[in-house]
């Protein structure tokens, strides 16, 4: 039996139905045979785990997804072994695998693969920061979102007015969330906003950074 | 040789109701899947039924489903087609055909006419 | 449900000549499409399967060609006994249609 599914990865927002299109051409007999189950991200594929099984005519679904798993067409005989997944969660993501057997046919695996992303907007991030907060030293705010799918990008921005920042003292890394100011000045002193951002929505968190003279140090 | 012979045909009122059968010989009906496929006069093909080996499953086109039902007995080596609430567009020849291991269909009968008519 | 298309309806050639007949799906069938042949009075007959594939007993000059939605059905030299209706047939999924034919007629 050969399987096709899509070559693309398929990504479905948190809470909604994810549909895994997978078709087949087979005369199908009485052997028929469907098993659709899942790997976790980064898990090989032969510690996979049974969702769902048809065979004799009746559907199986099993394991911890079975109450939110059922196919687009029961029976799969038609050609169509397409999954449907509903109220997708964080732990949906990984690789699902289609699998289609039916003696005699033999002539490929009937074994498709399908990434899915179950994508999640950014939690409330958390903001700290660290380092010397008096004229002259260095610090590092750092922001982090405990969720968020695809990963978050972060952008720090200062709050209200204030002179423009030489250049090199303030410098961000989107990807790991921090900024890092050096040489600071009392006008360094103010609200900071990380704002963390993915495809699905934006979360933010608040620092306010009080610069002392060298002798005292201080966040509030 | 692989032989399948229609049988069954004939004239029919409309809302009428007609079996046809097709016998095969030459190879191991039971594990074949088997379909019928009809043919209106001067028109081209359309499948109406399909049937795995061992009967468990039945497909049909919206055009005939509800209507038709396919069957089997593998002891006999004969493929069945029961059509009711038979219509005027009904009308034409029907062939048993053997479906490959994809479902093409490798091998035809000669056809059996329906006539649908009042 | 998919759509087949044929292209030309009928086709008028001589004996000797290269033949192409087109199909095409209303959507991607991969290489799942075959081809028939069909006398007038008789039934049809297998040529093409998987796009390519000739049974066995098949004359070479027919060949078959393409994948996803585009399909030709090529006779090389076309010879007395070819002249006949050829369909294309996608067996991707239910349900399995045909295309409405090619008429190959004498010149």
């Known amino acids: 039996v050969e399987v096709k599914v899509p070559t693309e990865p398929l990504s479905t927002p948190l809470g909604k139905t994810a549909e895994l299109t997978c078709t087949y051409s087979t005369s199908v007999g009485d052997s028929f045979a469907l098993e659709w189950s899942f790997v976790q991200p980064g898990k090989p594929i032969s510690e996979s785990h049974p969702i769902l099984y048809f065979t004799n005519g009746h559907l199986y679904p099993t394991g911890s997804k079975s109450k939110r798993v059922s196919l687009l067409q029961n029976p799969p005989t038609v050609g169509v072994a397409t999954l449907k997944l509903t109220d997708v969660h964080p732990s949906d993501t990984g690789t699902y695998l289609c699998q289609v057997n039916n003696p005699p046919d033999f002539y490929t695996n009937g074994l498709g693969l399908i990434n899915l992303t179950v994508l999640v907007p950014p939690s409330n991030p958390l903001c700290s920061q660290s380092g010397q907060t008096s004229v002259g030293g260095s610090t590092a705010l750092r922001c982090s979102s405990s969720e968020g799918a695809p990963k978050p990008v972060y952008n720090w921005v200062r709050l209200g007015t204030f002179p423009t920042p030489s250049p090199g003292s303030m410098v961000q890394d989107e990807v790991s969330g921090q900024l890092i100011l050096t040489n600071l000045s009392l006008t360094s002193s103010g609200t900071y906003r990380c704002v963390a951002t993915n495809q699905m929505g934006s979360a933010s968190c608040e620092l306010t950074l009080s610069v002392t003279e060298p002798s005292q140090g201080r966040v509030a | 040789e692989v032989q399948l012979v229609e049988s069954g045909g004939g004239l029919v009122k409309p809302g009428g109701s007609l079996r046809l059968s097709c016998a095969a010989s030459?190879?191991?009906?039971?594990?074949?899947?088997m379909s019928w496929v009809r043919q209106a006069p001067g028109k081209g093909l359309e499948w109406v039924a399909s049937?795995?080996?061992?009967?468990?499953?039945?497909h049909y086109p919206d055009s005939v489903k509800g209507r038709f039902t396919i069957s089997r007995d593998n002891a006999k080596s004969s493929l069945y087609l029961q059509m009711n609430s038979l219509r005027a567009e009904d009308t034409a020849v029907y062939y048993c055909?053997?479906?490959?291991?994809?479902?093409?269909?490798?091998?035809w009968g000669q056809g059996t006419l329906v006539t649908v008519s009042s | 449900d998919i759509q087949m298309t044929q292209s030309p309806s009928t086709l008028s050639a001589s004996v000797g000549d290269r033949v192409t007949i087109t199909c095409r799906a209303s959507?991607?069938?991969?290489?799942?499409l075959a081809w028939y042949q069909q006398k007038p009075g008789k039934s049809p007959k297998l040529l093409v399967f998987?796009?390519?594939t000739l049974p066995e007993g098949v004359p070479s000059r027919f060949s078959g060609s393409g994948s996803g939605t585009e399909f030709t059905l090529t006779i090389s030299s076309l010879q007395p006994d070819d002249f006949a209706t050829y369909y294309c047939?996608?067996?991707?999924?239910?349900?399995?249609?045909f295309g409405q034919g090619t008429k190959v007629e004498i010149k």
């Open positions: 055909a053997r479906q490959g291991v994809r479902p093409f269909f490798d091998y």
């Open positions: 030459g190879f191991t009906f039971s594990n074949s899947g």
């Open positions: 047939q996608h067996h991707y999924v239910i349900p399995w249609t």
């Open positions: 998987n796009a390519e």
């Open positions: 049937i795995s080996d061992g009967g468990l499953y039945t």
């Open positions: 959507e991607n069938i991969y290489s799942y």
